[in-house]
Every structure is written in structure tokens, then in C-alpha cells.
Amino acid sequence: EEELQVIQPDKSVLVAAGETATLRCTATSLIPVGPIQWFRGAGPGRELIYNQKEGHFPRVTTVSDLTKRNNMDFPIRIGNITPADAGTYYCVKFRKGSPDDVEFKSGAGTELSVRAKPSAPVVSGPAARATPQHTVSFTCESHGFSPRDITLKWFKNGNELSDFQTNVDPVGESVSYSIHSTAKVVLTREDVHSQVICEVAHVTLQGDPLRGTANLSETIRVPPTLEVTQQPVRAENQVNVTCQVRKFYPQRLQLTWLENGNVSRTETASTVTENKDGTYNWMSWLLVNVSAHRDDVKLTCQVEHDGQPAVSKSHDLKVSAHPKEQGSNTAAENTGSNER
């Protein structure tokens, strides 16, 4: 009778995370009598995975009928595989001993590799909004994938970006990996409706990459342009002055009218109109009673947009010496200035 050998026919086994791994093992002899044990790793720190003789191994099931006469097959199934299960598994024959069984012979080992899908990429932008022509950074993170090889691309509105840096960690061997990438994007005034997309391709995804998106509407601030104009006289001694607030984003905006530097009225943008590019327009008007003023009036439209320092535009109303006599022909010179 030839001495027993432990045969592990599979040098390696590749399993997708969440599935079941089958590890095969055959003994070439019934002699010596004794149980089979499965270990992950070798040496003193090896981890017991299954012991035919005793123990409770809820994730492990035996494939063959261990009690069948002449049985020399000892495969096991390990359920719900995770990347942490990766490693080399050894089938070890023990010889019946007293009081304890004695290790007799080990198989050559089967390397279990786990394919794990990357998590959905999470894209995050800068903490504070930025204005057009500024460069902002976006980060993309995905975790828990294996093997290490992975491809990451950045897009803005379908156009691939080239200015980015990517790291896969850890550098050495690991049960699973993470990817971190930072892309630089130059903002334009038309970016309110723009999207930045991070796309991750991995062998586990069967050619169907995962995508994470960020809307530039959460990143961009488009400051308004102001225009103050005087409208034709509405009634005797009354002038209607309007402040056009154009092309701003986001909507959060407060407007204050000043007459000769004194606050006349403050209002918050409410009934705005939206432009095709996603920015907003708004108009505010002020009715000025010219007869109440002896001297010229400096009207200022002051706008505080999205918590930023106020911008303003002024308009000078020239008041004549005898405004009552001029009636509806009151003259008013329009001299505007943009004050910030």
C-alpha cells in the first residue's frame, strides 16, 4: 500500500463576492484512519476553517458524504464569500491519536481569489462655491474591489477630462482595494446645468461601468450684472426707476434701494425668471416722488448675492429748482456708476 497523499487538484479558485467557493481535496488512501481538517494559511498562525472530527462551522458545508464507506473525497463549500476570505487553503489529513489526533500530511494548497465589485463611486466637490474662470477640484472615491486593476475616467458633460490624479490603495497585496481620484475643472458661466461624472470600470462589472455624478449647480456661483434705468414718468412728480439683476446663480439674493445713501427699501428675490443656461433674472423698481426732493437724488441699487459682498449700481436724478411748474416734463439726467 502506497503512503497516503493529499491531492488538491485546483491550484487556484476565483469566486465572486457573495457566492460560494468549492475547495476540492482527495486522499489517495484510507490509511491512516483520521479526520481531514481545512486551514487558511500555513504555520502556527493558520486559521482553522473546517474540522471533520469536531467543531461548529456555520459557513462551511461538506460536499461529499463523509460517512460513506471508502470515502476519500473531502471537498468543502464556503458560503457568502467576501474579500476577507482570500488566501491559500490547505487540506490536511490527521492520523488518529491518543489523546489528540496528529497531523499527518497536507495538500499543496488552493489559492482562493475573490472578485469583489467596487462600491458606487461617490463624487464630491468643493466646500464653497466658486465663480466662473476659477478652477475647482472634485474627488471621486470607490472602495472594496478586488482584484486591484481598475480604470477611472472623468467627464464633464460627456467630454473626457485629462487633468486628474488617481491613487489605488494599498500599494501592496490586500484583500480589497480603494481608489481615490481628484480632477480639476475650470468653471464657465454656462455651467449651471453642467455635470461632472466619475466612471469606474472593473473586471467584475462585465463592461458596465459604475458612475458617480456631481452637479455643478452645487458648486458654481454666477454673480449678477446690474442695470439701473429710469422709466418714463408714471404720474405727476413721480419717476419709476428699475434695477435689472441679470444672469445670477444661485437664486439667493437680497436687493436694497438707497436714496442719497439712505435705505429706502429692501427686498428678497422671489418671482425670478430662469434663463436657458440655468441662471436667473430679476427686476426691482422704485417709485421716486421728485417733489419731495429739493436737490438731485442719487439712487443706488445694492445687491447682496449668495452671502457675498454687495455690488451696486447708481443712478442720478437731477431735480430742477421749480419741480412743480415743470410737472410731467421733469428732467432727470441719468448718470450711472457701478460701485462695489
Epitope: E1, L30, V33, K53, T67, R69
Partner: antibody, heavy 119, light 110 residues
Framework: QVQLVQSGAEVKKPGASVKVSCKAS????????INWVRQAPGQGLEWIAM????????HYNQIFKDRATLTTDTSTSTAYMELRSLRSDDTAVYYC????????????WGRGTLVTVSS | DIVLTQSPDSLAVSLGERATINCRAS??????????IFWYQQKPGQPPKLLIY???NRDSGVPDRFSGSGSGTDFTLTISSLQAEDVAVYYC????????FGQGTKLEIK
């Protein structure tokens, strides 16, 4: 350490039944066959039957097929052998034994249970 | 059914001497490359103890003065140098089919 602990001695009248228990410890009960063997006073060993606790598959010696029933309770790792229609020549020590190699052999034995059948 | 016949029924051997017990099967017990014969030792008041499995393999903890041999139908248990603690009844058992035992051989010291 494998241990098989058997129930205590029994005295039965002819025609009665006896149920002997064998509680296993130190190993996974469902992975190994349990054999039952008896030995009449001053006589040799006589194999009765065997059971696989994993699925209750049984094999009986033809002599005992109609009178013996083997069962197991996997929740308590206990094997049972019931013998019916007892006769005086059933007086014997009844052993349970575990087959560690699935060779239909008897590697570990209980201490035995003496069953006396007497009117 | 396979019948096992042991010989002799009893045997007296001097301490330090060789003891030989035979077991003959009514038909071959060889199958799948193995001889399905087992030897047990039973001392008074104790359960039997497995000595040899598959004809020639010593069980764990069995002194190497015990050996088994044979093939097919004829098998032998040999104690190379009898010790006082070897006094017992020895049984062969087959498992080529369902198990049966030989009638036993009583070994005593001469």
C-alpha cells in the same frame, strides 16, 4: 477526547422491550457511524446494527432486523438501540461503538450496558 | 454471509515468546485494494479495543509488538514478545460486507 457514555443496567421480563442510550461527546456526532455490539456472559462479540446519524441510514444484522431499532437524537448527540420481544438469551452487555474511519470498524467503545432478561 | 473462523480457540504462550492467532474468512475480504479485516483485544470487564485495521495497520497507541498480516482469506495477528498485560481475548472482524466477528481466541501465559 471521544467519549461514549451509555445508560445504566436494566432488568427486563421476557417479552418486554429495552432501550439503551449512548451519549457521544468530543466529536461531531453526525460525521461518524455508531455501531451496536452485544456480548452474552462468557461469549464472543455479536454485531447488531449500525446507524449514520447524519441521515439515519441503518444496516442491521439479519438476526436482529425484526426486533432491533436504531435511532439518534442529533440535538443531544445521543444514539439509541431498542430491542423488543426480549428473551432470556438476550441477556448480555450491549456496547455502542463509533467508527472513526467509515471503515465499518469500531474505533471507540462505550463501557457497555448490562441488560438482564429474567422472569 | 462471510464467516470468520479463528484458530486456535485458546493459546498459552510464555512471556517474551511469540504469539500467533489466525483468522480465516469463508470468502475473500479484499475489495478496492484493501483487506477489510480488523483485530480487537478485550480484557476482562472492559470493552474491546481496536488493535489493527485493514489487516496490517496498527491503531494509534498500540505497541509495535503487535502486527497484522495476510490477504484475501487468511489473516494473522502476531505478538512478537508476549507481555503480561497482553493476556486477553482477541477477535477478528471483517467489514467486506456488513460486519461479523470471529468467535475469539483466549490468550494466556504459559
Amino acid at each position: 477526547q471521544v467519549q461514549l457514555v451509555q445508560s445504566g443496567a436494566e432488568v427486563k421480563k421476557p417479552g418486554a422491550s429495552v432501550k439503551v442510550s449512548c451519549k457521544a461527546s468530543g466529536y461531531t456526532f453526525t460525521n461518524y457511524w455508531i455501531n451496536w455490539v452485544r456480548q452474552a456472559p462468557g461469549q464472543g462479540l455479536e454485531w447488531i446494527a449500525m446507524i449514520d446519524p447524519s441521515d439515519s441510514e441503518t444496516h442491521y444484522n439479519q438476526i436482529f432486523k425484526d426486533r432491533a431499532t436504531l435511532t439518534t437524537d442529533t440535538s443531544t448527540s445521543t444514539a439509541y438501540m431498542e430491542l423488543r420481544s426480549l428473551r432470556s438469551d438476550d441477556t448480555a452487555v450491549y456496547y455502542c461503538a463509533m467508527d472513526y474511519g467509515s471503515l465499518y470498524a469500531m474505533d471507540y467503545w462505550g463501557r457497555g450496558t448490562l441488560v438482564t432478561v429474567s422472569s | 454471509d462471510i464467516v470468520l473462523t479463528q484458530s486456535p480457540d485458546s493459546l498459552a504462550v510464555s512471556l517474551g515468546e511469540r504469539a500467533t492467532i489466525n483468522c480465516r474468512a469463508s470468502q475473500s475480504v479484499r475489495s478496492s485494494g484493501y483487506n477489510w479485516i480488523f483485530w480487537y483485544q478485550q480484557k476482562p470487564g472492559q470493552p474491546p479495543k481496536l488493535l489493527i485495521y485493514l489487516a496490517s495497520n496498527r491503531d494509534s497507541g498500540v505497541p509495535d509488538r503487535f502486527s497484522g498480516s495476510g490477504s484475501g482469506t487468511d489473516f494473522t495477528l502476531t505478538i512478537s514478545s508476549l507481555q503480561a498485560e497482553d493476556v486477553a481475548v482477541y477477535y477478528c472482524q471483517h467489514s467486506r460486507e456488513l460486519p461479523t466477528f470471529g468467535q475469539g481466541t483466549k490468550l494466556e501465559i504459559k
